[in-house]
Amino acid sequence: KESCDVQLYIKRQSYHSIFAGDPFKLECPVKYCAHRPQVTWCKLNGTTCVKLEGRHTSWKQEKNLSFFILHFEPVLPSDNGSYRCSANFLSAIIESHSTTLYVTDVKSASERPSKDEMASRPWLLYS
C-alpha cells in the first residue's frame, strides 16, 4: 500500500547556477494524497533555516506531483545560498533536502560563464 505521507522531493546535492538580474523559479516537488499541505521556503543561515516571508510563491500541478515555487524576480546577488522547503502535515514538520543557488553577477564578468563552470568556480560566486 502506498504511503500517504507528504514527500518533498528536492534532490540530494542539487544546485542551480543562475545569473543576477534574471528571473528564476525554485521548485519544491510535493507529493501528497488528499489535502495539499501548507508549504514554506526557508534560507539556510549556518545551521538555522530562516523562513522567507512575503515572497512571491505559487503552486503548479503536474501529472503525479505538485510544485511549490519560489519566484525570484529578478535574482539578486544576495540570493546566493542554500534553501529548503518544509511542509506542515498532521502537526508535524517535514523538511526537504537543501538545494543551493549559485549566483553570479554578469556585470562582473566579461561574458556569461557556463552554468556548470559557475558551479565549479567559486570565485565567481557571491558568498
Epitope: Y9, K11, R12, H16, E62, L65, F67, H97
Partner: antibody, heavy 120, light 108 residues
Framework: QVQLQESGPGLVKPSETLSLTCTVS????????WSWIRQPPGTGLEWIGY???????KYNPSLKRRVTISVDTSKNQFSLKLSSVTAADTAVYYC??????????????WGQGTLVTVSS | EIVMTQSPATLSLSPGERATLSCRAS???????LFWYQQKPGQAPRLLIY???TRATGIPARFSGSGSGTDFTLTISSLQPEDFAVYYC?????????FGGGTKVEIK
C-alpha cells in the same frame, strides 16, 4: 507513457565533435532532470552528466572538459555534445530521465540507445 | 569516485533456481543510495530496485534487494526465462554517479 528517442550521426571522425539529441514524447521535459549515459561495446555503463529543464548541469569529471549538455524546452529535447572524440568514445549512448518522485539520482525511463562509432 | 564492484561476472543457473548477485561499494553508502537495473541484449537498462530494497513500479515480487554499508545483494527467488539478462548496480551517494561492471545471468 514517456518515451525517449536518441538521434544523431552513427559515425564520427576522431578529433571531431559527437552531437546527439534526445526527443521526449508522452510527457513534458519540464520539472525533470535528464541525463546521458553511455555503454562501450561489451562493457558497463558510464554516466556522462545531467541537465535540469531550467538549464542547470552537472557532468562526470572524467569527461567534463569535453562535454556540453543543453536543453530546448520548446522542442521537448535535450542534447549532448562531446568534443575531441577518440576511438575510446565509441559506445551506445542512452538518454534517460531521472526519477521525479525521488530524492535521488536514478533512471526510470531510457531511450533505446544509439551506437556511435568513432573512426576515420 | 565510488567504485562499484559486482560479482560474480557470470552466473550460470537453470530456470526455477535462486540467483544471488553481489554489489560492493568502495566506501560505505546508505541504503537509500543504491539501485539495481536489468538489461537484456539490444535493450536499454530497466530500473528494478531503488533504495536498495524497494521494487520499482511493475517489478515482480521474485526480485528483492538487501544490504547496507558497502555490501548489497539482488536476489531472484525463482528464475524465469525472461530473467536471464545482465544486472547492474548504481550508487548516487556521491557524484559522479557510478555503475558496477554488471553480472550476467545465463542459462545453464
Amino acid at each position: 507513457q514517456v518515451q525517449l528517442q536518441e538521434s544523431g550521426p552513427g559515425l564520427v571522425k576522431p578529433s571531431e565533435t559527437l552531437s546527439l539529441t534526445c526527443t521526449v514524447s508522452g510527457g513534458s521535459i519540464s520539472y525533470y532532470y535528464w541525463s546521458w549515459i553511455r555503454q562501450p561495446p561489451g562493457t558497463g555503463l558510464e554516466w556522462i552528466g545531467y541537465i535540469y529543464y531550467s538549464g542547470s548541469t552537472k557532468y562526470n569529471p572524467s569527461l567534463k572538459r569535453r562535454v556540453t549538455i543543453s536543453v530546448d524546452t520548446s522542442k521537448n529535447q535535450f542534447s549532448l555534445k562531446l568534443s575531441s572524440v577518440t576511438a575510446a568514445d565509441t559506445a551506445v549512448y542512452y538518454c534517460a530521465r531521472i526519477r521525479g518522485d525521488s530524492y535521488g539520482w536514478d533512471f526510470d525511463y531510457w531511450g533505446q540507445g544509439t551506437l556511435v562509432t568513432v573512426s576515420s | 569516485e565510488i567504485v562499484m564492484t559486482q560479482s560474480p561476472a557470470t552466473l550460470s543457473l537453470s530456470p526455477g533456481e535462486r540467483a544471488t548477485l553481489s554489489c560492493r561499494a568502495s566506501q560505505s553508502i546508505s541504503n537509500n543510495y543504491l539501485f539495481w537495473y536489468q538489461q537484456k541484449p539490444g535493450q536499454a537498462p530497466r530500473l528494478l530496485i531503488y533504495g536498495a530494497s524497494t521494487r520499482a513500479t511493475g517489478i515482480p515480487a521474485r526480485f528483492s534487494g538487501s544490504g547496507s554499508g558497502t555490501d548489497f545483494t539482488l536476489t531472484i527467488s525463482s528464475l524465469q526465462p525472461e530473467d536471464f539478462a545482465v544486472y547492474y548496480c548504481q550508487q548516487d551517494y556521491n557524484f559522479p554517479l557510478t555503475f558496477g561492471g554488471g553480472t550476467k545471468v545465463e542459462i545453464k
